[in-house]
Interface confidence: low
C-alpha cells in the first residue's frame, strides 16, 4: 500500500494510473466505501463524504489514463485508505495528515515558552525534530518545548516530520515580541534635553496594548511611575503623566520619550513596560540616564556624576590640551586651585570619551564661566 | 472584507451568448469555489454550477452542462460564467456566490440581469 | 437530484409572533451526524442572504430570532419574535450533495 503524508491546510494529489491511456470509469472511494468522486464520461461525479468541495480532479489529465484525488486545505481527520477503482482493479493509497502548531500563537514575549505540537492521525507514530532560526536542534515525539525564548529564535522554525521512512516539512514563522535592546544608556551633561527611545525589534499590523514607565532615581528612596500611556494600532497617547519631570511622548512607533532637561536628580533607572493586547505578560526595556555636572566653588573645582555607572569607568579633570590633573574610577574628582583655562570633565571607558563637561577657570578676582 | 462584485446588465438576441463577470477581492481569490445561481423574474434559485479558480475546475448541473463555461483569470481575481444558444428562458438575474466557514453560500454577488429579447 | 419543497408557499404574521417554515427533501441530507441544509432570506432586488447553515448554525451577525432545526429530510426555520423587517421570501437548499437545490420559496408578510 502506498503511503502519502500530507500537511494540514495543505493540498495534496493522489495519483491512480490505468494501464490505457484514454478516459475510462474510475471512482475514488474512502475506507468505508462512501464515494468521494468519480466520472461520467467527461462529467465529474461526487459523492456525499466529507470532503465536500475539497475535493477535486485534474480532467486535462484523464485522456492519458490519469485520474488523481486532489485533496484542499487538508485536515488530520482526512486521514485514511483511499481506494481507486479504475479498470476492475483497485488501487489504495494511505494518506496520513500531519499539522504541526505553536502554542496559542506565533507572536510570543521574549523569556516565555514555545511549545509547538503536532496533530497527527490515530495509530501513527511520527517523531520530529526541528531546527531554530540560530540552528539548535530540537526532538521530540507530539510535543517540543524551548524554554526562555531569545530574541534570535524570531524567524522560520523548520521541522521534518518523520513516518514511514517518509517526511513532510513544516515551516512555522515564530516572532519574539521584545525591545530591540534589553537595556540602554543615556549620558547627559546638566541641562540638556534627555531623549529616550525604545525601538521594538519586530513589526505587525497592529499593534495595540499599554505601557508605563517607572523611574527609579538614584537620591530617591522608591520608584516613581513618570508616565503612563495607551497604544493603539502603533497610535501614542499618554494617559498620565507625572508634572516633575513632565516628559513629552512621540504620537507614533516607535515609543520615543523626551524629558525636557537632565538634572542629578533624575539620575537613575527607569524600567519601561508594554503590555499588549491579547498577551499574557509584557515586554520590559531598562533605560538609564547618568548625569554629569561640573562646577566651580570658591578655590574648589568639582565634577560629579550621578545614574548607574559602572565601576571601571574613569572620571577625569584636566586642563585642555595638557594631561589628566586628577582621574578616578570615583562619581566625583575635584581640584583645589585650579589654574586659568578651560577645563574639561571626561567621563570614559577604557579611553573612549562618553561624557565630557567644559567649565572656564577665570583668574581668581572673577566668578567661573560655564559656556 | 469579502466582496463580490459583478458586471452589469446585458441585453441579448436569441441564440446569442453572455458572458457574466465577478470580481472577488477581500480574500485569496484561489482558496474558494465561486458559485453561480440563477434567478428568473419572481422565480426561485436554481445553482447552476461551480469553478475552483485555483485549477480551473469547473463542475455544472447537468441542466446547463451543454450551454455554461466558467472560467477563472487568477490574475484580476475574476471569475466568468458564459451562457451561450440564449432562449428567453434564459432571462434572469445571475448571482455569483462564495461559501463562508461553513456550508452555505455567506457571500454573493450583487447579480447581473440578463435579459434575452428579439 | 434531491428535490426540496416548501411549506407554506406564503404566510401572514403578525409583528411578536411565531412563523415557522419547513422544508422537506426527497432524500436525507444527513452525513456524519451533519445535515447539510441551509436556509435564506431575500429581499426584492438583493441577493439572498445566508441565515442558517448545517441547519441549525446561525450565521454571523443574524440575530437570534432565526433558529433552524431539523435532520434527515424534514426541516424547520423558525422567526420568533417576527418583526416588520422580516417581510422576504425564505429559501432552505441542501448542500448534500450535486446539483446544489433550493426549495421554491415561503413568502413572508408582515400583517
Known amino acids: 500500500k502506498k503511503v502519502v503524508l500530507g500537511k494540514k491546510g495543505d493540498t495534496v494529489e493522489l495519483t491512480c494510473t490505468a494501464s490505457q491511456k484514454k478516459s475510462i470509469q474510475f471512482h475514488w472511494k474512502n475506507s468505508n466505501q462512501i464515494k468521494i468522486l468519480g466520472n461520467q464520461g467527461s462529467f465529474l461525479t461526487k459523492g456525499p463524504s466529507k470532503l465536500n468541495d475539497r475535493a477535486d480532479s485534474r480532467r486535462s489529465l484523464w485522456d492519458q489514463g490519469n485520474f488523481p484525488l486532489i485533496i484542499k486545505n487538508l485536515k488530520i481527520e482526512d486521514s485514511d485508505t483511499y481506494i481507486c477503482e479504475v479498470e476492475d482493479q483497485k488501487e489504495e493509497v494511505q494518506l496520513l495528515v500531519f499539522g504541526l502548531t505553536a502554542n496559542s500563537d506565533t507572536h510570543l514575549l521574549q523569556g516565555q515558552s514555545l511549545t509547538l505540537t503536532l496533530e497527527s492521525p490515530p495509530g501513527s507514530s511520527p517523531s520530529v525534530q526541528c531546527r531554530s532560526p540560530r540552528g539548535k536542534n530540537i526532538q521530540g515525539g507530539k510535543t517540543l518545548s524551548v524554554s526562555q525564548l531569545e530574541l534570535q529564535d524570531s524567524g522560520t522554525w523548520t521541522c521534518t516530520v518523520l513516518q514511514n521512512q517518509k517526511k513532510v516539512e513544516f515551516k512555522i514563522d515564530i516572532v519574539v515580541l521584545a525591545f530591540q535592546k534589553a537595556s540602554s544608556i543615556v549620558y547627559k551633561k546638566e541641562g540638556e534635553q534627555v531623549e529616550f527611545s525604545f525601538p521594538l525589534a519586530f513589526t505587525v499590523e497592529k499593534l495595540t496594548g499599554s505601557g508605563e514607565l517607572w523611574w527609579q532615581a538614584e537620591r530617591a528612596s522608591s520608584s516613581k511611575s513618570w508616565i503612563t500611556f495607551d497604544l493603539k494600532n502603533k497610535e501614542v497617547s499618554v494617559k498620565r503623566v507625572t508634572q516633575d519631570p513632565k516628559l513629552q511622548m512621540g504620537k507614533k512607533l516607535p515609543l520615543h520619550l523626551t524629558l525636557p532637561q537632565a538634572l542629578p536628580q533624575y539620575a537613575g533607572s527607569g524600567n519601561l513596560t508594554l503590555a499588549l493586547e491579547a498577551k499574557t505578560g509584557k515586554l520590559h526595556q531598562e533605560v538609564n540616564l547618568v548625569v554629569m555636572r561640573a562646577t566651580q566653588l570658591q578655590k574648589n573645582l568639582t565634577c560629579e556624576v550621578w545614574g548607574p555607572t559602572s565601576p571601571k569607568l574613569m572620571l577625569s579633570l584636566k586642563l585642555e590640551n595638557k594631561e589628566a590633573k586628577v582621574s578616578k574610577r570615583e562619581k566625583a574628582v575635584w581640584v583645589l586651585n585650579p589654574e586659568a583655562g578651560m577645563w574639561q570633565c571626561l567621563l570614559s571607558d577604557s579611553g573612549q570619551v562618553l561624557l565630557e563637561s567644559n567649565i572656564k577657570v577665570l583668574p581668581t578676582w572673577s566668578t567661573p564661566v560655564q559656556p | 472584507q469579502v466582496q463580490l462584485v459583478q458586471s452589469g446588465p446585458e441585453l441579448k438576441k436569441p441564440g446569442a451568448s453572455v458572458k457574466v463577470s465577478c470580481k472577488a477581492s477581500?480574500?485569496?481569490?484561489?482558496?474558494?469555489?465561486i458559485h453561480w445561481v440563477k434567478q428568473a423574474t419572481g422565480q426561485g434559485l436554481e445553482w447552476i454550477g461551480e469553478?475552483?479558480?485555483?485549477?480551473?475546475?469547473?463542475y455544472s448541473n447537468a441542466k446547463f452542462k451543454d450551454r455554461v463555461t466558467m472560467t477563472a483569470d487568477k490574475s484580476s481575481n475574476t471569475a466568468y460564467m458564459e451562457l451561450s444558444s440564449l432562449t428567453s428562458d434564459d432571462t434572469a438575474v445571475y448571482f455569483c456566490?462564495?461559501?463562508?466557514?461553513?456550508?452555505?453560500?455567506?457571500?454573493w454577488g450583487q447579480g447581473t440581469l440578463v435579459t434575452v429579447s428579439s | 437530484d434531491i428535490v426540496l419543497t416548501q411549506s407554506p408557499a406564503s404566510l401572514a404574521v403578525s409583528p411578536g409572533q411565531r412563523a415557522t417554515i419547513t422544508c422537506k427533501a426527497g432524500?436525507?441530507?444527513?452525513?456524519?451526524?451533519?445535515?447539510?441544509m441551509n436556509w435564506y432570506q431575500q429581499k426584492p432586488g438583493q441577493p439572498p442572504k445566508l441565515l442558517i447553515y448545517?441547519?441549525?448554525n446561525l450565521e454571523s451577525g443574524i440575530p437570534s430570532r432565526f433558529s433552524g432545526s431539523g435532520s434527515g429530510t424534514d426541516f424547520t426555520l423558525t422567526i420568533n419574535p417576527v418583526e416588520e423587517n422580516d417581510t422576504a421570501t425564505y429559501y432552505c437548499?441542501?448542500?448534500?450533495?450535486?446539483?446544489?437545490?433550493f426549495g421554491p420559496g415561503t413568502k413572508v408578510e408582515i400583517k
Open positions: 456566490a462564495r461559501r463562508g466557514n461553513g456550508t452555505g453560500f455567506a457571500y
Open positions: 477581500g480574500y485569496t481569490f484561489t482558496d474558494y469555489v
Open positions: 469553478i475552483y479558480p485555483g485549477s480551473g475546475s469547473a
Open positions: 432524500q436525507s441530507v444527513d452525513y456524519d451526524g451533519d445535515s447539510y
Open positions: 448545517v441547519a441549525s
Open positions: 437548499q441542501q448542500s448534500y450533495k450535486d446539483p446544489l437545490a
